[in-house]
């Protein structure tokens, strides 16, 4: 019996088509992805093949103005329109709190939303009961398929799930649910979830009875043969894991941002064994036309976004210096504002011993593309912020050794004076440079804000200690020559859309007046 699994993950509000790098579409003839194009391809496959499932492995939320404005209603609406069969909860589905998940998505979705390792307690338990499920048995043709969901147990550190949701270990939580499916005579089981490729592989290895793993969170691109675009495969598609009980379990992921549609064909025998698995992600490029009815719907929803862009978010009573003459040479108050917003966006009081789990921010000065003049009645709009942060990036959470941070700050000034973008703006860090010294030896003082303290204060950086840092995804991926970050990071979790982080902070503060205060000397 042959099953076709179509899958997406980490779509992050890319409802409209995007450019090849998943930023705003400029030249339509070269744009990719978007729900209208996705629908065309999904329908094409549904018409051609008998047993098809369309699955999403989480993180539909967060990433563009679509989410900022519609807050998840857009996800429910367009996923319903595409007739998704199931979705797993990702960490970003909790970005607007549990209410921001329940009302727009859980209550509106016409497909099951799954996670076996999230357990509700207290007053939330009855409120959320039945709105998401540990597993769902889906009829597919003459057969039935069990889908079990899972979500990163790091979610409390990455989003805002509140205190009434407990995130359990994925493997521990999945096994009894899979066992339950087996007792219900369901022998074809897909684990669909959002914990990253390493955990996907562990689930394939450790959870008895899981036949296929469809994952997300790590934006992993897998491909067999010559890849069709710029993404470099982390392995073959599907990636085959040998389970502890001796079965070959295919593991798949489909990069991110709706650029590809994962396409996996599985042949099962009567016992539910995977006899064969093959496929590849399908690049959703302009050779696939956008479905006209979905496109018309997108255009209708788009109107509200254009209005939102010019509305006031808050006010500044000082000039926000985002000029390259400042931000690439010295501490600039735009850099301070952005870093303060990045830390504020990551306030998570999950442990009494820590005032917060992260205190540090670094930001490449070259990523700040425009100042904001306070003389326009102090008004700050989304449009203004889009000029400052035009690249559609995210502010991510990484774990780095102190020694890596020291290398990063040396790189920051290794060719100082040439107006290059690698000069770092900071938050929760005091750095002193001596530019008379030779490159690679210019950092003379590097103090960082403590986290395991009730009164935050600055302590010298320890080379062997592991620190959490918020930074742009551009830096996490080694951009502006920060190869040491990419090579040496111990953990990387993608965060919220850059503009959204800053706009939320400004809306919260109402009036801002960031200063230059001696963070960089």
């Amino acid at each position: 019996w042959e099953l076709t699994i179509l899958h997406t993950n980490d779509v992050h509000s890319r409802l409209e088509q995007t450019s090849e790098d998943s930023s705003k579409c400029v030249n339509a003839s070269r744009c990719m992805g978007g729900v209208a194009r996705l629908f065309t391809k999904v329908q094409q496959i549904r018409r051609a093949e008998p047993n098809v499932l369309l699955l999403d492995a989480g993180d539909q939320y967060q990433g563009t103005i679509w989410f900022t404005v519609y807050k998840g209603a857009e996800v429910a609406h367009f996923m319903n329109a595409l007739r998704y069969d199931a979705m797993a909860l990702g960490n970003h589905e909790f970005d607007n709190g549990v209410e921001g998940l329940i009302e727009p998505l859980l209550k509106e979705a016409k497909f099951p939303i799954l996670s076996a390792n999230i357990k509700a307690k207290g007053p939330l338990a009855s409120q959320i009961s039945g709105l998401y499920l540990p597993y769902k048995v889906l009829p597919v043709g003459d057969e039935v398929v069990g889908i079990v969901g899972y979500t990163s147990k790091e979610t409390p550190f990455l989003s805002n799930p509140g205190t009434n949701l407990v995130f359990e270990d994925e493997i521990t939580a999945l096994q009894p649910e899979v066992d339950k499916l087996k007792t219900l005579n369901v022998n074809k089981i897909i684990a669909l979830g959002h914990s990253g490729f390493e955990m996907d592989k562990l689930i394939a290895q450790k959870v008895r009875g899981v036949d296929v793993v469809v994952g997300g969170h790590s934006n992993t691109f897998l491909y067999t043969g010559n890849p069709p675009s710029k993404e470099v495969p982390a392995g073959k598609y599907p990636f085959i894991v040998t389970s502890d009980d001796g079965r070959k379990v295919p593991v798949v992921q489909a990069y991110a941002f709706g650029k590809y549609l994962g396409y996996l064909k599985i042949e099962f025998d009567e016992r539910g064994n995977v006899i064969s698995s093959h496929g590849n992600p399908i690049l959703l490029n302009s050779s696939i036309p956008e479905d006209p009815s979905i496109k018309a719907d997108i255009n209708k929803w788009r109107i509200k976004l254009d209005n939102y862009s010019t509305q006031e978010l808050g006010k500044t009573i000082v000039y926000l210096d985002g000029s390259s003459q400042s931000c690439r040479f010295r501490e600039c108050n735009m850099g301070n504002l952005i870093c303060d917003a990045m830390i504020n966006n990551n306030l998570r009081h999950t442990d009494e011993m820590f005032w917060n789990h992260v205190s540090m921010c670094i930001l490449n000065g070259g990523g700040i593309r425009s100042p904001i003049d306070e003389r326009n009645n102090g008004t700050i709009t989304w449009e203004n912020l889009a000029a400052v942060l035009p690249f559609g990036g995210t502010f991510d959470l990484v774990q780095l050794k102190g020694s890596t941070l020291k290398k990063a700050f040396e790189h920051s000034v290794h060719r100082y004076g040439q107006s290059t973008g690698e000069f770092l703006q900071v938050g929760g860090i005091h750095v002193v440079y001596d530019l008379s010294r030779k490159p690679g030896d210019r950092v003379v003082k590097l103090d960082v804000l403590c986290t395991k303290c009730r009164v935050p204060s600055y302590d010298p950086l320890k080379m062997d200690e592991v620190y959490k840092v918020i930074l742009p995804n551009f830096l996490a991926n080694g951009g502006d020559g920060f190869q040491m970050i990419k090579d040496e990071l111990l953990r990387h979790d993608s965060g919220d859309q850059d503009i959204n982080v800053v706009s939320t902070y400004i809306s919260k503060m109402k009036v801002i007046y960031p200063a230059v205060e001696g963070r960089i000397k």
Epitope: W1, G141, E143, T242, K248, D269, R271, N273, I275, S276
Partner: antibody, heavy 114, light 107 residues
């Protein structure tokens, strides 16, 4: 649990036909295939062909084409294999086996003798 | 048709021995290979499917490997109940074809 139950032993004369049945249970019958495999005394296994339960599509090994007919009765989840123009070398145990031979019937002994 | 050449046709071994049986296909069959065990008077039983996946209930001392045209069944430590005849089966293309069998006997 998958179960395949075959009809009883048959003794046939050369030139006659034999029809062996295989009743399946424990799985979604219409979604799969059934194979027929035979084993002559003291010999190895020989694949004869397969039938798709849902629509009756068949694929026969060239060696048996024209002599073998596989049919399906969806209402009773039963598959049949008929072999005609029997000769002494068709004396064998005939097995039905699921799609990828994960489960087998108990076998039906067919003896061709004058 | 794809020919499956199985070797050896028979072998004698003792309990605890490591046993290796090989199947060579006349052309590339991908991963489309099963290993079956048959005891006298019984129907065959599948041990391994898709080259290396172990059927449920089959002891972990059985393992399969290979690719392209060369495939191997290994019994890491032969047990008394393992004395039987073993067959490979390719299902890459019709007609499916079995190897000639390997009889594993007690030394």
């Amino acid at each position: 649990e998958v179960q395949l139950v075959q009809s009883g032993a048959e003794v046939k004369k050369p030139g006659a036909s034999v029809k062996v049945s295989c009743k399946a249970s424990g799985y979604t019958f219409t979604a799969y295939f059934m194979n027929w495999v035979r084993q002559a005394p003291g010999q190895g296994l020989e694949w004869m062909g397969r039938i798709y339960h849902n629509n009756g599509d068949t694929f026969y090994s060239q060696k048996f084409k024209g002599r073998v007919t596989m049919t399906v009765d969806k209402s009773t989840s039963t598959v049949y294999m008929e072999l005609s123009s029997l000769r002494s070398e068709d004396t064998a145990v005939y097995y039905c086996a699921t799609s990828y031979v994960g489960d087998w019937g108990q076998g039906t002994t067919v003896t061709v003798s004058s | 048709d794809i020919q499956m050449t199985q070797s050896p046709s028979s072998l004698s071994a003792s309990v605890g021995d490591r046993v290796t049986i090989t199947c060579r296909a006349s052309q590339d069959i991908g991963d489309s290979l099963n290993w079956l065990q048959q005891k006298p008077g019984k129907a065959p039983k599948r041990l391994i499917y898709a080259t290396s996946s172990l059927d449920s209930g089959v002891p972990s001392r059985f393992s399969g490997s290979g690719s392209g045209t060369e495939y191997t069944l290994t019994i890491s430590s032969l047990q008394p109940e393992d004395f039987a005849t073993y067959y490979c089966l390719q299902y890459a293309s019709f007609p499916w074809t079995f190897g000639g069998g390997t009889k594993v006997e007690i030394k």
